[in-house]
């Protein structure tokens, strides 16, 4: 799916209002709040692509994230603010149901959610930079690594 035509402001509002709370609650109490962020994104559509992949594509050691409340809310948000997103997900959901279930490793899921938090923060930052860029034409839009 191409996330270029999404309403990024509305997605940001949904994230800040609900999704972020669920992601952070998922991580609360864990010793590993300092996982290295190995996944990054360069612009808003790219961030949403990575977020979609990490949230809904099962990995060998963390197969269950798509069932979490933050994932369900992410799916609803993308369906609401990204034209045509729902249609593309019908086939993907059917394909996922056919995959065999794997053992969930809590630590791996925590690591994945930590990565997700980083991607969402980056999505918000790129959104802020874009808005700043529109208001100040002399603003140099260089990513902070």
């Amino acid at each position: 799916y191409d996330f270029t035509n999404c309403d990024f402001q509305k997605i940001e509002a949904d994230y800040l209002r609900t999704i972020s709370k669920d992601l952070i609650t998922y991580m609360s109490g864990t010793k590993s709040t300092d996982f290295n962020n190995t996944v990054s994104c360069s612009n808003r559509p790219h961030c949403l692509t990575e977020i979609q992949s990490l949230t809904f594509n099962p990995t060998p050691r963390c197969a269950s994230l798509a069932k979490e409340m933050f994932a369900r809310k992410t799916k609803a948000t993308l369906a609401l603010w990204c034209p045509g997103y729902s249609e593309t997900q019908i086939n993907a959901t059917q394909a996922m149901k056919k995959r065999r279930k794997r053992k969930v490793t809590t630590n791996k899921c925590l690591e994945q959610v930590s990565q997700l938090l980083g991607l969402w923060r980056r999505f918000i930052r790129t959104l802020l930079k874009q808005q700043h860029h529109h208001h100040h034409h002399d603003y140099k839009d260089d990513d902070d690594k």
């Epitope: 669920d22 952070i24 609650t25 609360s28 809310k73």
Partner: antibody
């Protein structure tokens, strides 16, 4: 003042039903996960159930799964526990407790508890 | 589900330092929180996460963690510290659940 006040505890026969309530005040209720924790006479603390800040997720200890239902009404700053098919081993002091906010996970506010006695 | 194990009873001389421990697989992944409960009273949170002390809790209470063991240390125990102490954490076998230790009765001599 941040406060939780439980009510609804009574004597009930085995197999009976009961609904506990917990009224919250002094904080933004819908920012927090909420828990029910119980303590049988002379015993330790036993976690019973939790509900997410918006009520979208609920989880239960194996000992009460399928019999107890946790819920909340954020507009009324209230937490509830519907208890069905009660057993004698459910007799305990039931506390509601405020759960995590952001990275903090301790239950930092507790009510004084309400007593449930299951006896024939 | 995971289990947290505590010593049933520990004693300390007034003014001395005591350490109460909590062991369990979930503590490799999650921090423990510690609660003090006096007879007839509701539990009070004394330590959460890495070593977070809520306001109103004396600084003689501190927490630490290593491997699958969490510790609550009271440096210079006072008579009013005599109570039951419980640890809890998230359950590593299902991180949506919560597990409590069996409790430690602290006696201040």
């Amino acid at each position: 003042e941040v406060q939780l006040v439980e009510s609804g505890g009574v004597v009930v026969q085995p197999g009976g039903s009961l609904r506990l309530s917990c009224a919250a005040s002094g904080f933004t209720f819908d920012d927090f996960t909420m828990h029910w924790v119980r303590q049988a006479p002379g015993k330790g603390l036993e976690w019973v159930s939790l509900i997410s800040w918006d009520g979208g997720s609920t989880y239960y200890a194996d000992s009460v799964k399928g019999r107890f239902t946790i819920s909340r009404d954020n507009s009324k700053n209230s937490l509830y526990m519907q208890m069905n098919s009660l057993r004698t081993e459910d007799s305990a002091l039931y506390y509601c407790a405020r759960g995590p906010y952001y990275y903090f996970y301790g239950m930092d506010v507790w009510g004084q508890g309400t007593t449930v006695t299951v006896s024939s | 589900s995971s289990e947290l194990t505590q010593d049933p009873a520990v004693s300390v001389a007034l003014g001395q330092t005591v350490r109460i421990t909590c062991q369990g697989d979930s503590l490799r992944t999650y921090y423990a929180s510690w609660y003090q409960q006096k007879p007839g009273q509701a539990p009070i949170l004394v330590i959460s996460d890495k070593n977070n002390r809520p306001s109103g809790i004396p600084d003689r209470f501190s927490g630490s963690s290593s491997g699958n063991t969490a510790s609550l240390t009271i440096t210079g125990a006072q008579a009013e510290d005599e109570a039951d102490y419980y640890c809890n954490s998230r359950d590593s076998s299902d991180n949506h659940l919560v597990v409590f230790g069996g409790g430690t009765k602290l006696t201040v001599l």
